[in-house]
Interface confidence: low
Amino acid sequence: MALPTARPLLGSCGTPALGSLLFLLFSLGWVQPSRTLAGETGQEAAPLDGVLANPPNISSLSPRQLLGFPCAEVSGLSTERVRELAVALAQKNVKLSTEQLRCLAHRLSEPPEDLDALPLDLLLFLNPDAFSGPQACTRFFSRITKANVDLLPRGAPERQRLLPAALACWGVRGSLLSEADVRALGGLACDLPGRFVAESAEVLLPRLVSCPGPLDQDQQEAARAALQGGGPPYGPPSTWSVSTMDALRGLLPVLGQPIIRSIPQGIVAAWRQRSSRDPSWRQPERTILRPRFRREVEKTACPSGKKAREIDESLIFYKKWELEACVDAALLATQMDRVNAIPFTYEQLDVLKHKLDELYPQGYPESVIQHLGYLFLKMSPEDIRKWNVTSLETLKALLEVNKGHEMSPQVATLIDRFVKGRGQLDKDTLDTLTAFYPGYLCSLSPEELSSVPPSSIWAVRPQDLDTCDPRQLDVLYPKARLAFQNMNGSEYFVKIQSFLGGAPTEDLKALSQQNVSMDLATFMKLRTDAVLPLTVAEVQKLLGPHVEGLKAEERHRPVRDWILRQRQDDLDTLGLGLQGGIPNGYLVLDLSMQEALSGTPCLLGPGPVLTVLALLLASTLA
């Protein structure tokens, strides 16, 4: 098939913004001699024009010709030709840039069969969902472990989708990992969130030691807690030796002062003395034992012609000290919205953050905060406590950055500052927060919940209430009752069901008259004090066909306490074999008032039940 030789400067690869970035990269020498494994080191890339357009055989091209292909050239090729190109690149060990890999992956529309024939790093850019079967995913992720995951920054969508897919593929449930699991994950183990570090410290900490990028806040806190806890493999900091410090090299930056203080001083001194003679150790040692941001060159002037006139893509080629010297903090503050679109490294972002910190020591203004984007992930809770965030748009913009992740300490602090700044939890704020964090409602105290308007209750889903405790449901239930009051019986029950943990006895009695067939799981979440006064007949009507489930729960609250309150004769009418009711001929006295006055702690229910033998005959009572 003849392919067109003429091609646009940039093809359909990526967004317009990416297109212009690529154009900039080309003009700044993107097509560089890359080091290749086939010995092409230091060779110039051959002229590119039309080189892929019509060769008799792509595999006949030399590594030098293949080295610098632009995205636009690939966008003109058929899928089959793209596959041929990918295989040729792999065979000739051509080292590709991230953009080239992304571009190839974009054009390989269907999941390739011959994974082993493709460039290893190309797999990072393929969608793992395309390899969903157990054999397919195992083959895919076995190859991925050998790829250089760090070609992708941590925030890159391609990287973010790999870890959950890999965990699912290897059958990891929960947060407990084996050594084999960690090995199978390869470089992706460096992305495991803090809960894995907390539960699998013994196997995971030695792996995190060699992760190239910095750990995120969540991982750092978990690693710090695990190291401070003194469990395996390193033991308590007070027992560490110089060899332990060596083994921990990559985790040294996360050690807090409490840990450093508990390491024997002689060990720290010996280790510092030795590491100062070994250049490869100077970086981590400096990181943990001196202030966090250190200028490499204290008062370096900006080189001629390098002063930044605006925040643009050219800055990604600046060294850290050049950014520090050549970017004006005020300029950065006014053009913060541009930072997010530029692929800065973590180290470069640290420099930019430091510049803002110097410009605004009392905390950033909202105009800057709103445009922080991914720089927000670099902020500490201490930084955020200095902010005054009043705009819901600012809150949304920053929550968007953290979307899909668990609530981090930074986000928790941000929300706290926002709500305190507003003085109340209005509907718009609540809607925004529950949209990003479904469990948010249950994270509020009863006092805070009391300011939630009933109209907001309509947006609450059952799973949003999973972590609510009885005191919170006590506040939410009346609001839900008010919100759903105009619905008919069955619809009302569906909506109110998840709030019933806060329902009083009279409402449960009313529900028992409506054939609602409450399931046992809901019944078990009801307030014990609300269940106790219900009669056997009322419970039978309330549960309907589910009443048989009481037998399985007879030893658990509230069923256990309710059984103790019922006459055995009445329980027997259910035909379930429930035992523990009050025998016939006994009188029940409720001494809950007396107990309250005596101040005795009550462990089994709201008021102990005292049964005494009746002195009067049953017939006399009748």
């Epitope: 969130p193 803090g194 809960r195 907390a198 969540d218 806190e221 978990a222 807690a225 809770p381 406590r385 668990e406 609530m407 981090s408 300490p409 928790a412 602090t413 706290d416 709500v419 305190k420 469990g439 249950c442 994270s443 509020l444 105290s445 805070e448 972590t467 405790d469 009885p470 919170q472």
Partner: nanobody
Framework: VQLVESGGGLVQPGGSLRLSCAAS????????VAWYRQAPGKEREFVAS???????SYADSVKGRFTVSKDKAKDTVYLQMNSLKPEDTAMYSC???????????WGQGTLVTVS
Amino acid sequence: VQLVESGGGLVQPGGSLRLSCAASGSMFSINAVAWYRQAPGKEREFVASINTDGTTSYADSVKGRFTVSKDKAKDTVYLQMNSLKPEDTAMYSCIYCRYDGEFAYWGQGTLVTVS
């Protein structure tokens, strides 16, 4: 979240102390709050914990002598320590587990010396 423990100090055997663990910078509800202690040269050990619903658990060595409680309105958890013994000497720290179980926050600790 910042945790600040207080209430530690020097006390004679048989005496009492009440430790507090206050959380600042957070309005988030908590699943569990636990007290741990670490004596010089020993490993950190669990002392007591309290869940959102108020249920408590204790290490065997402190059962009947220590009581854990909380004041939700003040975001503070207390450890009432009675009949103190010399072996209770340690640095006492509290840990807050966030409601979604995702993060644990440790305090810096408060020193209790029974002598």
